[in-house]
């Protein structure tokens, strides 16, 4: 997370880190818990050649990576069938865990957004994660969850951002309908924050608008950062994750 | 001692039903996924069917699908899998296996228990 | 579905041999598993995330491989090392073991 402040304790109970094994299990993105079985994270993170069950485990939310890990191992890995790279978009993946999480009021889900949801700019929006804290920057020990309050910007404002000094025809898209764009050079998401959740604050409810996807560099002029919106992919979410009683 | 002791197999008609028993000791059993694993004679290993720790989590091989069931009682240290409709070909000894919780290989093994399917 | 082939599905070999058995996946995997089992005996752990050697089992066993190649080698083979080896992925459900390979005295 560029810019922001260490997340306080109380904030964000659905932010989870995914670990990979190696010779720690060590943070590679972030994810969310929407459900006490269901972790949403980006295609990118575990595809599209899809790691071993044996690789991957979801550590859910703590204040400070690997200072009280309770790794929880993952039952199925589902990758959205029409990813390929995340530029191209379908950058959406769900994990199923072994077992529920017992929620309280430190781990709990998200909300999901209603279809009819389109997080307009000027809604206050945050994004959360363990990843770099500027460009090739990584997050120093005791490496905290960090927040940042980013802005949304509209999709044909951000396309034409990114067109800015491109060699892709303006008549290509870039930004397309199944993306959100926020961010700017003060505050952005980064490397190892691929996967996390940006949330909006929408009549008292935290949302999940967005899956931390791409971006050219973090931070960067007329590059904000680019995520997968998660009202795209309802139909998709629910073919597989219970909706809540 | 860390210990799982398999039980009641024996003979059976085609059609018939069978439930086995895996009596498991020495560990905290409800840490643990668990996994049958079959071995028909002179034959492979096969992988059965898979529980989590809680239950909450099962898998099966495609051709036991329908047919088995595994199930676990914690409270009691005991798996089970339930076996109906069963074929000559599930003939086999039928091993208890639990999952280490780090590297999720199959660490202990019970003996077996032989299951004969046959008129 | 993965399957797993073992080669050679048996060998015959000496003490004292350098032995290799391959295990090839029909698609990609991180790790393989491998088990040892002698006749009349529950099978027993043997090398685990592809390299890694379960306890009590003696150096000069290995284990390399990646994608869908791995193999488990034997440096010098000793008398206690015949029995039937089993290679196994843990990618994805349902999980499969490979048909075995039984190292046989010469």
């Known amino acids: 997370i560029v810019g922001g402040q260490e997340a306080p304790r109380s904030k964000w109970p659905w932010q989870v880190s995914l670990r990979v094994h190696g010779p720690y299990w060590m943070h590679f993105c972030g994810g969310s818990l929407i459900h006490p079985q269901w972790v949403l994270t980006a295609a990118h993170c575990v595809g599209p050649d899809v790691k071993d069950l044996a690789a991957l485990r979801v550590q859910l939310r703590e204040q400070h990576l690997y200072y009280q890990d309770q790794l929880l191992p993952v039952s199925r890995i589902i990758v959205h069938p029409q990813f390929y790279t995340a530029q191209i978009g379908a950058d959406i993946a769900l994990l199923e865990l072994e077992e529920p999480v017992n929620v309280s009021s430190h781990v709990h889900t998200v909300t999901l957004p209603p279809a009819s949801e389109t997080f307009p700019p000027g809604m206050p929006c945050w994004v959360t994660g363990w990843g770099d804290v500027d460009n090739d920057e990584r997050l120093p020990p005791p490496f905290p969850l960090k927040q940042v309050k980013v802005p949304i910007m509209e999709n044909h404002i951000c396309d034409a951002k990114y067109h800015l000094g491109a060699y892709t025809g303006d008549d290509v898209r870039i930004v397309r309908d199944d993306m959100l764009c926020a961010g700017n050079t003060r505050r952005d998401s980064c490397q190892g924050d691929s996967g996390g959740p940006l949330v909006c604050k929408v009549n008292g409810t935290w949302l999940q608008a967005g899956v931390v996807s791409w971006g050219e560099g973090c931070a960067q002029p007329n590059r904000p950062g680019i995520y997968t919106r998660v009202t795209y992919y309802l139909d998709w979410i629910h073919h597989y994750v219970p909706k809540k009683p | 001692e860390v210990q799982l002791v398999e039980s009641g197999g024996g003979l059976v008609q085609p059609g018939g039903s069978l439930r086995l028993s895996c009596a498991a000791s020495?560990?905290?059993?409800?840490?643990?996924?668990m996994v049958w694993v079959r071995q028909a004679p002179g034959k492979g290993l096969e992988w059965v069917a898979f529980?989590?720790?809680?239950?909450?989590?099962?898998y099966y091989a495609d051709t036991m699908k329908g047919r088995f069931t595994i199930s676990r009682d914690n409270s009691k240290n005991t798996l089970y899998l339930q076996m109906n409709s069963l074929r000559a070909e599930d003939t086999a000894v039928y091993y208890c296996?639990?999952?280490?919780?780090?590297?999720?290989?199959?660490?202990?093994w019970g003996q077996g228990t032989l299951v004969t399917v046959s008129s | 579905d993965i399957q797993m082939t073992q080669s050679p599905s048996s060998l015959s070999a000496s003490v004292g041999d350098r032995v290799t058995i391959t295990c090839s996946a029909s698609?990609?995997?991180?790790?393989m598993y491998w088990y040892q089992q002698k006749p009349g005996k529950s099978p027993k752990p043997w090398i685990y995330?592809?390299?890694d050697l379960a306890s009590g089992v003696p150096s000069r066993f290995s284990g390399s491989g990646s994608g869908t190649d791995f193999t488990l080698t034997i440096s010098s083979l000793q008398p206690e090392d015949f029995a039937t080896y089993y290679c196994q992925h843990y990618h994805s459900y349902p999980l499969t073991f490979g048909q075995g390979t039984k190292v046989e005295i010469k």
């Open positions: 020495g560990f905290t059993f409800s840490d643990y996924g």
């Open positions: 296996t639990r999952r280490n919780y780090d590297d999720l290989y199959f660490d202990v």
């Open positions: 529980i989590s720790s809680g239950s909450s989590t099962v």
């Open positions: 995330r592809t390299s």
């Open positions: 698609s990609s995997v991180t790790y």
